[in-house]
C-alpha cells in the first residue's frame, strides 16, 4: 500500500451506535446463518477520515494493552509499535504480557520511502468493539522504523487484512484474519463502511467524529441501501479485482481494458486516493477537465499540489462529473458499475490561510503499480470482503456524502464480453509487493 499517502488521525473511540434497520426482503441469494443482520457492537468502531486513515481499537497481551490500529486491506501483517518513539503516545510492551511468545525471528519491511523492522512473536489479541473472541495472533513488534509512524497521529500499529501471499517475511506468517477465522466461529468475511466527513475536521471535531464501521464476520443492513453487487477476487494476495470499463459522466474512456488493471487493481483502505495507471490517469483527467471547463483550474490542482477554494457553501459540485468503474460480475459476460461523485474525489482540506473558504484537493492520482481503489472509492460504498466466497461486494453506503441532485450508485447488470482479457498477468518474479 502507498504508505506515503496514509496519514494518521488524532482521536479516541466512542460514539453511539447507529439505529439498525430491520433486514429487508431482497432478491439476493440466501446466505448461511450468522453472516447478516445486526452487529450493533461493531457499528461506529472506526475513527478517521479519508486523508488520514481509519483505525480500530484493539487490545494485545495479558493484561490487555489498548492500541489504535490502522485498518489496511492493502497489506497482511499485524504490526505494532513496540519501543519508545517520539511520535507514539503508547506502544506494545511485550515484557508486561504474560502471554507473549517470542518467535525468535526478525521482519524487515521497506517502502519506497521509509521502512519498519521488528521482531516476530505471538500474543492474545481482541477487538473491544468487535466479535467477543480472543485469538492468538502473529504480531510484528516494531522496534525500529523510518518514516512509518507519523507525528501527531493517534495510531500505534497497522492491521493488514489482505492474504498471506503478501505477508512479510514470507507467506508462512499467518495474517490476523486467518488466525481469527481458524480459532473461532467467526465467518470468513468482514465488511467496511468508511465515512468521509465531507468537510475538513479540526482536531476537536475529529475527536467527536464517527469514522465508520468494520463489521467482522458479517454484513450489517443498516450500513447500506439498495443491493450488494459482487465482483470476484481475481487472486488472493491483495484484494485484486478486474475493472472492465471506465466512464466519466457516462462517457466511455474507450481504452483497452487491460490498461485499467495494469499491473493490477486492488481495493485498499490504507490508501487515500483513487490511484490510476499513468495512461488511465491522463485520460481521466483530460475528460474531467473537459467536463468541468466552465472554471479554469490550475495545472497544480490536477496534480494534487494546489487546492481549489470557493466561498463557504458555494462549491459548484454540479460542474464536476461522476466517475463510474465497471467491475467484472459473478456471472459470465455480466458486469456492474460503481459510481462516485465529486464529493468523494474532491477531498476537503482545512487550511488556516484560506479558512473562510471551502477548499479541496483533487484526490485522484497517478500510480506506477496499477489501480488502487482507496478511501476515495470506499467512502461511497459499503464494501464486503467475502473471503469465503472469494468475492468483494459493493453497495451504496448509508453514510456517503452527496447532494440533492446526485448520489453514489451501484447498478447492474450490464453485458460485457471478454472480461477475462482485462486482467493483466504479472510476469512471475520475486515480487517486492510493498515497494510501491
Amino acid at each position: 500500500t502507498q504508505h506515503g499517502i496514509r496519514l494518521p488521525l488524532r482521536s479516541g473511540l466512542g460514539g453511539a451506535p447507529l439505529g439498525l434497520r430491520l433486514p429487508r426482503e431482497t432478491d439476493e441469494e440466501p446466505e448461511e446463518p450468522g453472516r447478516r443482520g445486526s452487529f450493533v457492537e461493531m457499528v461506529d468502531n472506526l475513527r478517521g477520515k479519508s486523508g488520514q486513515g481509519y483505525y480500530v481499537e484493539m487490545t494485545v497481551g495479558s493484561p490487555p494493552q489498548t492500541l489504535n490500529i490502522l485498518v489496511d486491506t492493502g497489506s497482511s501483517n499485524f504490526a505494532v509499535g513496540a519501543a519508545p518513539h517520539p511520535f507514539l503516545h503508547r506502544y506494545y510492551q511485550r515484557q508486561l504480557s504474560s502471554t507473549y511468545r517470542d518467535l525468535r525471528k526478525g521482519v524487515y519491511v521497506p517502502y519506497t520511502q521509509g521502512k519498519w523492522e521488528g521482531e516476530l512473536g505471538t500474543d492474545l489479541v481482541s477487538i473491544p468493539h468487535g466479535p467477543n473472541v480472543t485469538v492468538r495472533a502473529n504480531i510484528a513488534a516494531i522496534t525500529e522504523s523510518d518514516k512509518f509512524f507519523i507525528n501527531g497521529s493517534n495510531w500505534e500499529g497497522i492491521l493488514g487484512l489482505a492474504y498471506a501471499e503478501i505477508a512479510r517475511p514470507d507467506d508462512s506468517l499467518e495474517p490476523f484474519f486467518d488466525s481469527l477465522v481458524k480459532q473461532t466461529h467467526v465467518p470468513n468475511l468482514f465488511s467496511l463502511q468508511l465515512c468521509g466527513a465531507g468537510f475538513p475536521l479540526n482536531q476537536s471535531e475529529v475527536l467527536a467524529s464517527v469514522g465508520g464501521s468494520m463489521i467482522i464476520g458479517g454484513i450489517d443492513h443498516s450500513l447500506y441501501t439498495g443491493s450488494l453487487w459482487y465482483t470476484p477476487i481475481r487472486r488472493e494476495w491483495y484484494y485484486e479485482v478486474i475493472i472492465v470499463r471506465v466512464e466519466i459522466n457516462g462517457q466511455d474512456l474507450k481504452m483497452d481494458c487491460k490498461e485499467y488493471n495494469y499491473d493490477k487493481s486492488i481495493v485498499d483502505s490504507g490508501t487515500t486516493n483513487l490511484r490510476l495507471p499513468k495512461k488511465v490517469f491522463e485520460a481521466a483527467v483530460k475528460s474531467i477537465k473537459a467536463a468541468s471547463s466552465t472554471e479554469k483550474f490550475p495545472d497544480g490542482f490536477w496534480l494534487g499540489e494546489q487546492l481549489v477554494c470557493w466561498q463557504a457553501g458555494t462549491t459548484p459540485w454540479n460542474i464536476f462529473p461522476v466517475i463510474s468503474l465497471y467491475l467484472m460480475g459473478e456471472v459470465t459476460n455480466q458486469s456492474f458499475r460503481i459510481t462516485i461523485l465529486p464529493q468523494q474525489y474532491l477531498r476537503p482540506v482545512e487550511d488556516v490561510a484560506t479558512s473562510q473558504d471551502d477548499c479541496y484537493k483533487f484526490a485522484i492520482s497517478q500510480s506506477s503499480t496499477g489501480t488502487v481503489m482507496g478511501a476515495v472509492i470506499m467512502e461511497g460504498f459499503y464494501v464486503v470482503f467475502d473471503r469465503a466466497r472469494k468475492r468483494i461486494g459493493f453497495a451504496v453506503s448509508a453514510c456517503h456524502v452527496h447532494d440533492e441532485f446526485r448520489t453514489a450508485a451501484v447498478e447492474g447488470p450490464f453485458v460485457t464480453l471478454d472480461m477475462e482479457d482485462c486482467g493483466y498477468n504479472i510476469p512471475q518474479t520475486d515480487e517486492s509487493t510493498l515497494m510501491t
Partner: antibody, heavy 116, light 107 residues
Amino acid sequence: EIQLQQSGTELVRPGTSVKLSCKASGYTFTNYWMHWVKQRPGQGLEWIGMIDPSAAYTNYNQNFKGKATLTVDTSSGTAYMQLSSLTSEDSAVYYCARSGVAFPYWGQGTTVTVSS
Amino acid sequence: DIVMTQSQKFMSTSVGDRVSVTCKASQNVGTNVAWYQQKSGQSPKALIYSASHRYSGVPDRFTGSGSGTDFTLTISNVQSEDLAEYFCQQYNSYPYTFGGGTKLEIK
C-alpha cells in the same frame, strides 16, 4: 501555528555544493507540497521547483534542472534543497514556501553567498 | 513560460490615499493569480489568492481583481506600514512565474 524554519546563512566557495534545509511545523508535513524560490539581491522572485513530501515526486523549473535537487525527510518534517557547482550567479536568498492555494506560507529565507 | 509584467517599478502615494498596482499575464491564467507583499529584509507575505480572495488575517483595505490576463491589487486608505514591494504570481501552469515587483513609496 504554521512555521517554516530555514537553515542559516551560507558562505561557500565556487564549484562546491550546499544543502539548505526547511523544517516545517504546525501542520501535517506530507499533506502539502513544498516549493523553493530564489531571490537575487534587488531582484524579483524565481520559482525553482517543488516536491511532494508524501511521494518524493519533484517538478523543476527547466532553468534549475541540474542545479537544484529537492529532497524531504518526512520523519523530521524537513525539506532540503541541494545546490551544486556553485557560481556567483547562485548568490541569493532562497526561500521555501508551502503550497495550498498559491504559496500561503514562506520561510524566513537562507542567504547563500558564493565567493572565493 | 507565462510572463507576468508589472509595468510600474515604483509607485508613490500618501497615507490615506488609494493606490492600484497592475499586473499583466502573457496568456490567459483564469483567476489563478496571487499577490505578495515583501518588506525590506523580510520574506514575502501572501495577501491575495484566486485573484480576489484575501488570505486570512489580511486587512480588508487590500483587494484584488481581474481575470484572464489583467490583474489589479488595490490598497485603499494606504497606511505607512504598507511601504513594501508587491509581487504578482501566476500559479496556473508550471513553471510558476512572478512579476518583477512594484515598490510602493510613501510620500
